[in-house]
């Protein structure tokens, strides 16, 4: 039998000799030559050798654990003389022994993390990794310390874990928002002679919000003539934050003051600023000043950071109306009027009203202003600024109708007031699906029944535009003696499929089907679309090989287009039947 | 799975008024034209009333119009019937059925009934 | 308004027998006609839209034809879930009508 333990090699071995491994044995060796050794499988003759006659292994390679940690191989002994095995072929290991030839590795070679400025000492920043080659069953090659190299005192590492945390409190992004940590990593435990990695941690400082809103200035003053019509800006003010984002956000409001209900702050989102606007018509003769306490806040405190004071500032506005003849003021700013798209001419959609608001109070006429009515479409009653249609609408044509109507004094021409009214027309199911695209294709002469040979899709024009729900089906004319049947799937699409085992292009070398398309919409709408269908010659994959070469030719007037209704015209067989077209009616 | 579920029905007296709902599952409610149909207990079916799937136009069968009004919220994919001066004879099973033409989808129906 | 007319009011079959309701229309309706089955107390369902197509989920035994004003609804084996009131129904012209049914009882 075969005398050995498993063999144990070092990696990485230096030495001029070839390293020796150790002996293959059989007890049958009387050590007189009669025996020959021969080894097999992993790097046998290249990396590792056998003396064969006395089954002495030697590695003549230097080998590295990490590339290859074991090799399998096998051991034969046969008797010279015979040729024959004096043992059977045995598998053997030859395990490749590990030294720390391997520095630990960082997963990457730059970090990026965040930390809330502010943040409590240990918070968890980020976890870094290295990870070691070497073997981590044997010896210390392979435990990795973490420690930090530069970014103190601001954050410390777990030695075992890689976790950064913060090590200093109050760090204020304000005064500083970028850090650069170096970390560490070092093999054998941290211990002397241990191979080490280096890795970058760039910390930024993320936001937190510690910093309240100030006006620059005490008092504000603006002037506003008093048509200012509501939602007019009257001027602008301005809190600043050291903070950023959304814990720079400021939201402004009127605290106090004798213009409360006369006057709005609201914020431009993207300025910050506080826009003051006038909330309600204005009146010279009745007030000239307004003083408002406008405040601006934080709207995104957090309560931690109250025992700084209070998230908040307030200033002192104040508004000065200037006197103006005025000219008239509608009610709205704005109309939005509908209508239906099937609306008669003469219907009324609505009506707008203006008046002088001067003492004087002059009447006033109405007028559409016909730079934005080209087309006459509408018209407005001049006396009691009634809108009425004057022509046919159409919404698939036009959805909104943005026309101007102008109030005039009739005392005073040259005082008018302009309000835009948004007429919306509303959809009437006034359109029928048709095919989404000019259908023509072919069947194969040795088709088999229920070939599917096209799918068809429709559209249609009316609302909803993606909602619709569509059925096909063959025009009744059609239907009875027809070569094809349609499948609707019900899906929004149908499928044409042949209705027979094989067709002759010689006897009949198009087909034209009506297909009927309709909606689910109220009134259904439907309409007619014509597939042109031409019997061809094909390989056995199916393929179009050469259909009939005459082109297809129609009567003036015919088309076989999406949506085309054919109908019968005396002399129109003869000219189909010609071209060997199959008339469906 | 679609669902229709009406609700709202009950007794009430000539000249009164009832609001029917039929609240819409399982599909695309803003999509499809919804209608109303009545059946007379012991009579066949009668066609009420249909609404467009945006809102926009409303159709209604003479003998109710003037009096009945359909609508519906989207948002809240449910369907209305308002039905004012109620008589006799509009003592039926009110379904509400999804599409505008054919009604591949009712509800289970709800019973008004105008009696003095 | 389009008068839709069912024909038998009623008819008695049994159990595997081919059953054939008709629907004539007072106009011609094109294609536009619908069938539709109700049983006692339950809302009625959708069999067949456009004439002749099949809703989905309804058994291939129900089949429709025709066009113009002469509609038919064949059953071709009667089974046991098939008792019930069949309606016709035209969408080519408001107001929509319906036929006045047609039950379907047992022999």
């Known amino acids: 039998s075969w005398m050995w333990n498993q063999f144990f090699l070092l990696e990485e071995y230096t030495g001029s000799d070839y390293q020796y491994v150790g002996k293959l044995h059989s007890d049958q060796d009387r050590g007189d030559g009669s025996l020959k050794y021969i080894l097999s499988g992993d790097g046998a003759g290249d990396l590792f050798i056998i003396n064969e006659n006395t089954g002495d292994i030697q590695a003549t390679k230097r080998l590295d654990r990490e590339e290859k940690p074991v090799y399998i191989l096998r051991a034969q002994a046969i008797n010279r003389r015979t040729g024959r095995p004096v043992e059977p072929e045995s598998e053997f290991i030859i395990k490749i022994h590990d030294i720390n030839d391997n520095e630990p590795i960082f997963t990457k070679d730059v970090y990026t993390a965040t930390v809330p400025e502010m943040a409590d000492v240990g918070t968890f920043v980020v976890q870094v990794t290295a990870t070691d080659a070497d073997d981590p069953t044997y010896g210390n090659s392979a435990k990795v310390v973490y420690s930090i190299l530069q970014g103190q005192p601001y954050f410390s590492v777990e030695s075992e874990t890689g976790i950064i945390k913060t090590a200093l409190l109050n760090m204020d992004r304000e005064n500083r928002e970028q850090y650069q940590v170096v970390i560490q990593a070092k093999d054998m435990g941290g211990q002397m002679g241990g191979l080490s990695g280096t890795t970058t941690v760039n910390i930024t400082l993320t936001d937190v919000n510690d910093n309240p809103p100030r006006f620059p200035q005490s008092t504000y003053q603006f002037k506003t003539p008093e048509s200012s019509p509501p939602g007019t800006p009257i001027g602008r003010i301005k809190a600043s934050d050291a903070d950023v984002g959304e814990n720079a956000e400021i939201e402004y409001s009127i605290t106090d003051g004798e213009g409360h209900d006369m006057f709005d702050v609201i914020t431009d989102q993207e300025t910050q600023e506080g826009i003051i606007t006038v909330k309600k018509l204005l009146d010279f003769e009745k007030k000239r000043v307004y003083t408002l306490k406008v405040e601006a806040s934080n709207p995104h405190i957090e309560p931690r950071f109250l025992y700084l004071g209070p998230f908040k500032d307030s200033a002192t506005v104040r508004i000065v109306v200037d006197d103006v003849d005025e000219p008239p003021v509608f009610s709205k700013l704005a109309y939005i009027l509908q209508i239906r798209e099937d609306a008669q001419i003469n219907t009324t959609i609505g009506s707008v009203a203006a008046q002088d608001p001067d003492a004087a109070r002059n009447p006033v006429k109405y007028s559409v202003d016909r730079h934005t009515d080209m087309d006459r479409i509408f018209n407005i009653d001049s006396g009691n600024g009634s809108i009425f249609t004057s022509k046919l609408l159409d919404r698939e044509t036009l959805l909104w109708h943005n026309i101007t109507v102008i109030a005039t004094e009739i005392n005073n021409p040259k005082q008018s007031s302009r309000v835009p009214l948004y007429i919306k027309v509303l959809d009437v199911n006034d359109n029928a699906p048709e095919f989404a695209e000019f259908y023509e294709t072919f069947v194969c002469e040795k088709a088999k029944a229920d070939q599917l040979i096209q799918t068809l899709h429709a559209v249609d024009k009316d609302d909803p535009y993606s909602g619709h729900q569509f059925s096909f089906s063959l025009a009744p004319e059609a239907a009875s003696g027809s070569n094809f049947t349609i499948q609707d799937n019900k899906d929004n699409t149908a499928g044409i499929l042949t209705r027979k085992n094989g067709y002759n292009r010689h006897e009949m070398s198009t087909y034209l089907l009506p297909v009927v398309i309709s909606d689910n919409d109220y009134p259904v709408q439907s309409s007619t679309g014509t597939v042109t269908v031409r019997v061809c010659a094909c390989d056995h994959h199916g393929n179009m090989q050469s259909c009939h070469a005459e082109a297809l030719i129609h009567p003036t007037g015919l088309s076989t287009g999406a949506g085309s209704e054919f109908r019968h015209d005396s002399g129109l067989n003869d000219i189909f039947e010609a071209q060997k077209i199959e008339w469906h009616e | 799975q679609v669902q229709l579920l009406e609700s709202g029905g009950g007794l009430v007296q000539p000249g009164g008024s009832l609001r029917l709902s039929c609240a819409a599952s399982g599909f695309t409610f803003s999509s499809y034209a919804m209608s109303w149909v009545r059946q007379a207990p012991g009579k066949g079916l009668e066609w009420v009333s249909v609404i467009r799937s945006s809102g926009s136009s409303t159709y209604y069968a003479d003998s109710v119009k003037g009096r009945f009004t359909i609508s519906r919220d989207n948002s809240k994919n449910t369907l209305y019937l308002q039905m004012n001066s109620l008589r006799a004879e509009d003592t039926a099973v009110y379904y509400c059925?999804?599409?505008?033409?054919?009604?591949?989808?009712w509800g289970q129906g709800t019973l008004v009934t105008v009696s003095s | 308004d389009i008068q839709m007319t069912q024909s038998p009011s009623s008819l008695s079959a049994s159990v595997g027998d081919r059953v054939t309701i008709t629907c004539r229309a007072s106009q011609s309706i094109s294609l536009w006609l619908n069938w539709y089955q109700q049983k006692p107390g339950k809302a009625p369902k959708l069999l067949i839209y456009a004439a002749s197509t099949l809703q989905s989920g309804v058994p291939s035994r129900f089949s429709g034809s025709g066009s113009g004003t002469d509609f038919t609804l064949t059953i071709s084996s009667l089974q046991p879930e098939d008792f019930a009131t069949y309606y016709c129904?035209?969408?080519?012209?408001?107001?929509?009508?319906f036929g006045q049914g047609t039950k379907v009882e047992i022999k």
């Open positions: 129904q035209q969408y080519y012209t408001s107001p929509y009508t």
């Open positions: 059925a999804r599409g505008g033409g054919y009604f591949d989808y």
